[in-house]
């Protein structure tokens, strides 16, 4: 019918989203570069060059990561979008003045266990939860 | 003894970071204003400024909020920092042009109930997941 | 007071490699970032690289990748920049400074390279 | 990369009057990481300015940083003798770091 028919442009438009966003996510740039999707970038960080060596006997450092990237419409599969962020996205598109885009934060932690040294001068093993990002998306 | 009131001065100092943070938070802006921390913001959205009138029945727009506001140093409880966020905030301060301090995200999200048309016009009551922000966090 | 002294610099043919040192004093050297930056003669300045306290973190300008090594030796209070594969547009005056969170709160008085057949 | 263009180029005056120094930046520099040296001949770089308008220490406060985005100024709210040297803005925010290419404050 014509109102189902309606419907379907409806979705496939959602209003003027999707040539608005080609443009505006061709153009959102770091570094006069086209800044790349949500995703994982590898980060090695010491803990000297935290100042926490003193007190953390091992490891010296880990494999932290972090979460980078732009969260444009669309959002494809892999940027492990929550529902809201979809919205986000598609307001952000409406209104960019007022309300951002959503962004590329951890989806996955890992924990690390760290020897160091308390407050008494005991060497304690603890495990530390959420220190290494698995994966990213778009929150 | 002079090895524990090191590694104590070694926790409090982490190496530059306290004064460069006092300054760099203090100096973080946004087009002028202090930007303020990261912090749930009120958003209603309506369903006919998306184009999805045609397809969605009820409700006519939900209160989907949003999250934004900076993560700087030092990151309070307040900010549902993970540890990771902790860590990322810390190489930032070292290495600003190349780690971006952490984003302000989603941390508890609600879900609302949709009745929608399908594609063969069928009336559908469907729960969607991760609707609505409750509370922000930097991750 | 905080003082860092280059050496090292001088006239090298192209091809060739230098090893340029910075010398700090004045303040607790294995507490902070340290960076090269060179400046052409009658030019701006322009960032060469720069390493983190341990020596694990370490970024180079796109000029310079794969030629220049920066390292430091925090037990000795010194940076180091080795200079390979050196072309005509390398020839500068190269200061060492010292880094806080992306600003340089002090700078040697420079060392200068030159690079001529 | 970010380009920082500085203006003017050169900036005639006298002791005593009032120095405004533009940069500006080809995109926005993040979280206003910017920061102001001055540089006489044959001498280092001094850092003047941080974080667009945070003094470091020991510069008086007759320099003043400000802005934001794009645009960033260094003000000398009167010119001092010593005050005459070239001034050279330096974002960052975004990789790679990098300088402007110097605005020459001379007297008149």
């Known amino acids: 019918s014509a109102s189902s028919r309606r419907r379907q442009q409806s979705r496939n438009r959602s209003t003027q989203s999707q040539d608005v966003a080609r443009v505006s996510s061709a153009s959102d740039y770091n570094s006069s570069e086209l800044k790349t999707a949500c995703r994982k970038h590898e980060l090695y960080v010491s803990f000297q060059d935290l100042g926490w060596q003193d007190w953390i006997i091992a490891p010296k450092g880990y494999a932290a990561n972090y979460c980078d990237g732009e969260c444009s419409f669309p959002l494809n599969a892999h940027m492990n979008a929550t529902n809201h962020a979809i919205v986000q996205t598609l307001v952000h598109l409406m209104n960019p003045e007022y309300v951002p885009k959503p962004c590329c934060a951890p989806t996955k932690l890992n924990a690390i266990s760290v020897l160091y040294f308390d407050d008494n001068s005991n060497v304690i093993l603890k495990k530390y939860r959420n220190m290494v990002v698995r994966a990213c998306g778009c929150h | 003894s002079a090895s524990s009131r090191r590694r104590q001065q070694s926790r409090n100092r982490s190496t530059q970071s306290q004064d460069v943070a006092r300054v760099s938070s203090a100096s973080d802006y946004n087009s002028s204003e202090l930007k303020t921390a990261c912090r749930k913001h009120e958003l209603y959205v309506s369903f006919q400024d998306l184009g999805w009138q045609d397809w969605i029945i009820a409700p006519k727009g939900y209160a989907a909020n949003y999250c934004d506001g900076e993560c700087s140093f030092p990151l309070n409880a307040h900010m549902n920092a993970t540890n990771h966020a902790i860590v990322q905030t810390l190489v930032h301060l070292m290495n600003p042009e190349y780690v971006p301090k952490p984003c302000c995200a989603p941390t508890k999200l609600n879900a609302i109930s949709v009745l929608y048309f399908d594609d063969n016009s069928n009336v559908i009551l469907k729960k969607y997941r991760n609707m609505v922000v409750r509370a922000c966090g930097c991750h | 007071q905080v003082q860092l002294v280059e050496s090292g610099g001088g006239l090298v043919r192209p091809g060739g490699s230098l090893r340029l040192s910075c010398a700090a004093s004045?303040?607790?050297?294995?507490?902070?970032?340290m960076s090269w930056i060179r400046q052409a003669p009658g030019k701006g300045l322009e960032w060469v690289s720069y390493?983190?306290?341990?020596?694990?973190?370490?970024y180079y300008a796109d000029s310079v990748k794969g030629r220049f090594t920066i390292s430091r030796d925090n037990a000795r209070d010194s940076l180091y920049l080795q200079m390979n594969s050196l072309r005509a547009e390398d020839t500068a005056v190269y200061y060492c400074?010292?880094?806080?969170?992306?600003?340089?709160?002090?700078w040697g008085q420079g060392t200068l390279v030159t690079v001529s057949s | 990369e970010i380009v920082l263009t500085q203006s003017p180029g050169t900036l005639s005056l006298s002791p005593g009057e009032r120095a405004t120094l533009s940069c500006r930046a080809s995109?926005?520099?993040?979280?206003?990481?910017l920061a102001w040296y001055q540089q006489k001949p044959g001498q280092a770089p001094r850092l003047l300015i941080y974080?667009?308008?945070s003094r470091a220490t020991g510069i008086p406060d007759r320099f003043s940083g400000s802005g934001s985005g794009t645009d960033f100024t260094l003000t000398i709210s009167r010119l001092e003798p010593e005050d005459f040297a070239v001034y050279c803005c330096?974002?960052?925010?975004?990789?790679?770091?990098?300088f402007g290419q110097g605005t020459k404050v001379e007297i008149k």
């Open positions: 390493i983190s306290i341990s020596g694990s973190t370490i």
């Open positions: 330096h974002q960052y925010g975004s990789s790679p770091p990098t």
């Open positions: 004045g303040f607790t050297f294995s507490d902070y970032y």
């Open positions: 974080g667009a308008s």
């Open positions: 995109q926005s520099v993040s979280y206003r990481y």
């Open positions: 400074a010292r880094r806080t969170s992306g600003w340089y709160d002090f």
